[in-house]
């Protein structure tokens, strides 16, 4: 542990002004694991002036950083690049004349205290004012900066010409695209100071290529994958003062696929489970032994989970009997195509067969559930019932 400091397994605190520290505290190679340090507290260190790029990077678990009543003048731009867990930073009463947004833009800080620093009034610190105003909490800090006449100006009153938040405008005239096709998005950013622009495509699967020059750019997405339906694409404008982003959601249309169809399982009801993917939402149609299965209150399609363009559900059967044994085919159809899959279902054995084996399914042992055949009857020929089921999720949203 450095002189003038005390160290524990999770904390480093340096508050003794004599002899004091001249550099950010670093742990000896064979001492405490720096990854376990969650708090660093530094006070009364008048000779500590700089945080270098690599000073803090070893403390990847750091959550609270306090440097107060010290001589801090300069913080390197990438000083906190590796400290993604940082939540609280307190630089009260130091010698900071400027501080860039770039230090903190990747952090999700809940507190940044900068009171008592001799900031110079310039566009470089306008982001602090913007941040303060955006938070608009009752405990707003009293921050000041020194103007050209070395007069202390409240940051709240600071007016700097040609110094404001940028704006990003993302144009995507048609964001509904067929699987396998391509799309080009355009973005234009503006602001003073002139912002940089970049694309944030998240975890986009499809191949994409961006061409960005100054304040304008285009993003070309080719051979679009159905897995990208619902994904968000953002164009970001960033300058000294802050950033702005404009986002759009991609909608990919594709033919249905039945990714899962299994033999029936019994829970509260009997269920033939299935999973269908497709966009627009596919219409579902069941066939029983080759004939259209008209649904009723005893036998119907239920969608239990909708995950954007994927639908998990059941063909639900109430008290099926041997009359319902047979081949069940599911057809999923939309304007882009269709898919079908078939399974064989065995609900119970045939009555009166003593050996307990179903002649149609000699390997399956049946149990008698004691249900009457007329509970369901012949479901293949009910003219007054719904011939097909459209997939909608419970919220009634269109996808």
């Amino acid at each position: 542990c450095p002189t003038s400091c005390k160290c524990s397994a999770s904390r480093i605190w340096c508050s003794d002004p004599s002899p004091g520290i001249v550099a950010f505290p670093r742990l000896e190679p064979n001492s405490v694991d720096p990854e376990n340090i969650t708090e660093i507290f530094i006070a009364n260190q008048k000779r500590l002036e700089i945080i270098n790029e690599d000073d803090v990077e070893a403390y990847v678990g750091l959550r609270n950083l306090t440097i107060v009543d010290s001589g801090l003048k300069f913080v390197a731009h990438k000083a906190f690049l590796k400290n993604s867990n940082l939540q609280h930073i307190n630089f009260t009463r130091n010698k900071l004349t400027s501080l860039s947004r770039k230090h903190f833009r990747h952090l999700d800080l809940s507190e940044l205290i900068l009171v008592g620093n001799p900031f110079t009034c310039s566009c470089d610190i306008m982001w602090i004012k913007t941040l303060q105003e955006a938070k608009s909490s009752p405990d707003t800090q009293d921050l000041y900066c020194l103007n050209e006449s070395s007069k202390n100006i409240p940051l709240a009153n600071l007016q700097i010409p040609n110094c404001g938040l940028p704006s990003a405008n993302l144009a995507a005239p048609n964001l509904t695209v067929e699987e396998g096709k391509s799309i080009t998005l355009s973005c234009s950013v503006a602001g003073d100071p002139v912002p940089n622009m970049y694309w944030d495509v998240g975890n986009l699967v499809s191949k994409h290529m961006n061409e960005t020059s100054h304040t304008q750019g285009s993003l070309r997405i080719t051979n679009i994958s159905s897995d990208d339906s619902g994904k968000q694409i953002s164009c970001v404008a960033e300058n000294l003062v802050g950033e702005d982003q404009d986002s759009v959601n991609l909608t990919v249309h594709f033919a249905p696929t039945i990714t899962f169809l299994e033999s029936p399982t019994s829970d509260h009801h009997w269920c033939i489970p299935f999973t269908v993917k497709g966009n627009p939402k596919p219409a579902l149609q069941w066939f029983y032994n080759g004939a259209i299965l008209n649904e009723s209150k005893y036998i119907c399609t239920k969608i239990h989970v909708t995950n954007h363009t994927e639908y998990h559900g059941c063909l639900q059967l109430d008290n099926p009997t041997h009359m319902n044994n047979g081949d069940y085919t599911l057809i999923a159809k939309n304007e882009y195509g269709k898919d079908e899959k078939q399974i064989s279902a065995h609900f119970m054995g045939w009555p009166g067969i003593d050996d307990g084996a179903n002649p149609n399914y000699p390997d399956v042992i049946y149990e008698d559930y004691g249900t009457a055949a007329n509970d369901i009857g012949d479901t293949t020929n009910r003219s007054n019932e719904i011939p097909s089921t459209d997939v909608t999720d419970k919220t009634g949203r269109e996808h």
Epitope: E133, A134, G164, S167, A172, T184, D192
Partner: antibody, heavy 118, light 115 residues
Amino acid sequence: QVQLVQSGSELKKPGASVKVSCKASGYTFTSYAMNWVRQAPGQGLEWMGWINTNTGNPTYAQGFTGRFVFSLDTSVSTAYLQISSLKAEDTAVYYCASRLAAAGFDYWGQGTLVTVSS
Amino acid sequence: QAVLTQPSSLSASPGASASLTCTLRSGINVGTYRIYWYQQKPGSPPQYLLRYKSDSDKQQGSGVPSRFSGSKDASANAGILLISGLRSEDEADYYCAIWHSSAWVFGGGTQLTVL
């Protein structure tokens, strides 16, 4: 200083084509998108779309696809708007506009009046 | 219903203040939008005045006097352009605009007369 200078007024017959030019000076032409805005006589402003002056990729607003084409000649820092199969309702002042320092359109051409009449 | 609605005309006296409104269509929340304002005089192109979203996100056009300011009325779902100390040269058409659904959308404009 920054200037956008547009070509002069045009009188065209229905079915004809027109090409309006917008010459930029005082800034790096290929660094900022060029927008086109229409204003019919006595009416409000209507955004037609923009062209990426670096790649030449156009973006058209709804209602301005098909007969409207944005193009560039970067060697002379000029953007063009071509309208084909002109109709009487295309009669309007057409502006080019750019966003340089501001978030809004801070530089505008003087406008080109296109009159379509038989 | 139009995305942005502006009163077609407004009259005010020199030295007074004028409040020009730009109402967003129901279902489009003014709080999430930056409202842009332009002034247009007869025979001239529009001139950018300012942008307003909130007190922490606003921008005055270059050379635009501080007499022109922006605000919002959340209860009316509207953006407001306030012109104080009206002068005869403020007589013009005023347009609001927002970036909405991948396009710049302009209001129909308000003709301001300084009596």
